[in-house]
């Protein structure tokens, strides 16, 4: 089942995905695609990283966090209703059938029509993240027998619009991450 994330038309959407590299520099290729994760790779790839860099991306899709430390969360800029749907984050761990696949459902809501702004609303518009809530869901852990010392933790519900890369560290300590090594 997919975890659901929401954004309004015109906002940036945030789809979280994390892993912890086994050691600094030991990056794992990651792909993001539109549509549920297929058996292999990602369908309709929008962004891809390799062992060193982001090596493919399309307009409006980017990584805002520190992907060299495993924060491969996807930001989609200036979303429209057409961006609704399932997105696949695939951590491409070496070995046969070792990939971790995460299906994230993005729901785009029409932009709210707001009355003429008051001073207080101006403040809220200037600092929208002050009002963001951050939810941590339960985690489910599995161990791969075919790769020694690789511990994978299923991504669970993270708050929408988490943009600060430091939060990756808070989240991984609450189980919202994949640990490799």
């Amino acid at each position: 089942s997919e975890v659901e994330y929401r954004a309004e038309v015109g906002q940036n959407a945030y789809l979280p995905c994390f892993y912890t590299p086994a050691a600094p520099g030991n990056l794992v290729p990651v792909c993001w695609g539109k549509g549920a994760c297929p058996v292999f790779e990602c369908g309709n790839v929008v962004l891809r990283t390799d062992e060193r860099d982001v090596n493919y991306w399309t307009s409006r899709y980017w990584l805002n966090g520190d992907f060299r430390k495993g924060d491969v969360s996807l930001t989609i800029e200036n979303v429209t209703l057409a961006d609704s749907g399932i997105y696949c984050c695939r951590i491409q761990i070496p070995g046969i059938m070792n990939d971790e696949k995460f299906n994230l459902k993005l729901v785009i809501k029409p932009a709210k029509v707001t009355p003429a702004p008051t001073r207080q609303r101006d403040f809220t518009a200037a600092f929208p993240r002050m009002l963001t809530t951050r939810g941590h869901g339960p985690a489910e852990t599995q161990t791969l027998g075919s790769l020694p010392d690789i511990n994978l933790t299923q991504i669970s519900t993270l708050a929408n619009e988490l943009r600060d890369s430091r939060l990756a560290n808070d989240l991984r300590d609450s189980g919202a991450t994949i640990r490799i090594g």
Epitope: T20, P21, A23, P24, N26, W62, R68, K69, R166, R172
Partner: antibody, heavy 125, light 108 residues
């Protein structure tokens, strides 16, 4: 303020091993990679390796593989470096240094924003 | 390995002078270059990151420039506390780092 406090100077015999420590304070230890750097007397700086305190994974300069072993103790926010089979060439000051904050994906790697005071190692018979 | 060559090895200046220290990389490193100051019997201190980005708490007389293979650290009106050794470091080959040989800034 962020501080990295290193263990004191040591005098060791050739062939011995030494384990030095670097205790971090005033920041979340697991959030920043920790580097170790060697400075021989009157010489430049040489990067030894880096460790991720979150999971203990380490990456080494090829020159120091088998010579240096990096470990951490998350519970005490302490990083360790063990140097083995010491020779006179290993006499130096050794620093721990924290990788700085993430600065954006258009840059590669990190600067080292906080350094320990150094541990002096003298290898002599 | 990327080699960083610093020049000059020693620079003798009078307080109040403005100076420029050079760091040249053996291949392009974009702007993944950082500058450190080390005073006698002290640890290195980060002065500039990513070629030109200032560091909180570092006096504004220190500035950095360059990209690709040629970089410079400028000190506008040197003060007596600025004497010491200056090192450049590249992070382009992260997680493997290398340092330059250093430039010693001394009083004339």
């Amino acid at each position: 303020e962020v501080q990295l406090h290193q263990s004191g100077p040591v005098l060791v015999k050739p062939g011995a091993s030494v384990k030095m420590s670097c205790k971090a304070s005033e920041y979340t230890f697991a959030d920043y990679y920790m580097n170790w750097v060697k400075q021989s007397h009157g010489k430049s700086l040489e990067w030894i390796g880096v460790i991720n305190p979150y999971n203990g994974g380490a990456t080494y300069n090829q020159k120091f593989k088998g010579k240096a072993t990096l470990t951490v103790d998350k519970s005490s926010s302490t990083a360790y470096m063990e140097f083995s089979s010491l020779t006179s060439e290993d006499s130096a000051v050794y620093y721990c240094a924290r990788d700085a904050d993430f600065y954006g994906n258009s840059y590669v790697g990190y600067a080292m924003d906080y350094w320990g005071q150094g541990t002096s190692v003298t290898v002599s018979s | 390995d990327i080699v960083l060559t610093q020049s000059p090895a020693t620079l003798s200046v009078t307080p109040g002078d403005s100076v420029s220290l050079s760091c040249r990389a053996s291949q392009s490193i974009n702007t993944d270059l950082h500058w450190y100051q080390q005073k006698s019997h002290e640890s290195p201190r980060l002065l500039i990151k990513y070629a030109s980005q200032s560091i909180s708490g570092i006096p504004s007389r220190f500035s950095g420039s360059g990209s690709g293979t040629d970089f410079s650290l400028s000190i506008n009106s040197v003060e007596t506390e600025d004497f010491g050794i200056y090192f450049c470091q590249q992070s382009h080959t992260w997680p493997q780092y290398t340092f330059g040989g250093g430039t010693k800034l001394e009083i004339k």
